[in-house]
């Protein structure tokens, strides 16, 4: 039975040209995290594997940095980076947990972070 929950940074906004940290945290389970995949809509951004470490997709190597922790740092943001991001936690024995973050990249200097929320 899957008892865990994923807490994410929720709906966030950031300035064009700036950076943002995407963070998810799995709690309420003793399952072993074997891998975390980060995806932007239908594109793989990065993978953090417990044994192999980080793999950053070649097309994002210049703008994506691993961490902190299991999170992901996006740099040199453009308006095209606006959209949904997913953290996919592969665990044993529970299976897969998915968290969602919506990032809005703003032209203006008014960029506020949204509230944290939980996805069961």
């Amino acid at each position: 039975m899957m008892t865990g929950t994923i807490e994410t940074t929720g709906n966030i906004s950031a300035e064009k040209g700036g950076s943002i940290i995407l963070q998810c945290h799995l709690s309420s389970t003793t399952a072993q995290v074997t891998q975390v995949n980060w995806e932007q809509q239908d594109q793989l951004l990065a993978i953090c594997n417990a044994d192999l470490g980080w793999h950053i997709s070649p097309s994002f190597k210049d703008r994506v940095a691993p961490g902190p922790g299991l999170g992901l740092t996006l740099q040199s943001l453009t308006v095209n980076d606006t959209g949904e991001y997913f953290c996919i936690y592969h665990t044993y024995p529970d299976g897969t947990y998915t968290g969602r973050i919506f990032l809005e990249v703003l032209e203006s200097s008014v960029a506020e972070h949204g509230a944290r929320f939980q996805i069961p």
Epitope: E39, Q43, L44, N49, D51, L52, S59, H90
Partner: antibody, heavy 118, light 107 residues
């Protein structure tokens, strides 16, 4: 240099058994998921089974479930495929492959031929 | 199960030609799509992983694109050593499935 070397193939009668081995070298075997993929003569590729590096996930194709068993011995850097109740349609070249990040098969062995015939 | 449909099943082309092979999944597989090249009597070789990432050591004339259900492998300028059979494969969910293959032959 990453190397995968399959062995154990051969001619077996229908209903018989074989155990294939895949000896791995050149990488930290226990860190990688591994898969078996087969190819019948003149046909395409068919996934058979996969096993995670350390956590206990194992997956099988429906066509072999209950007859084949995938296993690994990380101390020997070896992957196995125990094949029981073999059928003529199991005739194929069997490849082992390394699967980084449970995603893509980046290195393959040379294959071992299994022929099931009376 | 996710079905992978490749087209064409075979094609004839000349050295220097631009070749495009398509692969369609029966449901969305995000970018969990890989491409392999196989020559007769040899093991498959990984060309492209995660839909568009070029495997180390593979010539840059190979490229992949697509996401969701529709994917493309492109060889920008066909070389003599590229005549082979190409397979797509989804790793979105088990059972892992391959396309039926595309045989690229010399015209």
């Amino acid at each position: 240099e990453v190397q995968l070397l399959e062995s154990g193939g051969g001619l077996v009668q229908p209903g018989g058994s074989l155990r294939l081995s895949c000896a791995a070298s050149g990488f930290t075997f226990s860190s990688y998921s591994m898969s078996w993929v087969r190819q019948a003569p003149g046909k395409g590729l068919e996934w058979v089974a996969s096993i995670k590096g350390s956590a206990g996930y194992i997956y099988y194709a429906d066509s072999v479930k209950g007859r084949f068993t995938i296993s690994r011995d990380n101390s020997k850097n070896t992957l196995y495929l125990q094949m029981n109740s073999l059928r003529a349609e199991d005739t194929a070249v069997y490849y082992c492959a390394r699967v980084p990040y449970d995603y893509w098969m980046d290195y393959w062995g040379q294959g071992t031929l299994v022929t099931v015939s009376s | 199960d996710i079905q992978m449909t490749q087209s064409p099943s075979s094609l004839s082309a000349s050295v220097g030609d631009r070749v495009t092979i398509t692969c369609r999944a029966s449901q969305s597989i995000s970018s969990y799509l890989n491409w392999y090249q196989q020559k007769p009597g040899k093991a498959p070789k990984l060309l492209i992983y995660a839909a568009s990432s070029l495997q180390s050591g593979v010539p840059s004339r190979f490229s992949g694109s697509g996401s969701g259900t529709d994917f493309t492998l492109t060889i920008s300028s066909l070389q003599p050593e590229d005549f082979a059979t190409y397979y797509c494969q989804q790793s979105y969910s088990t059972p892992l499935t391959f396309g039926g293959g595309t045989k690229v032959e010399i015209k």
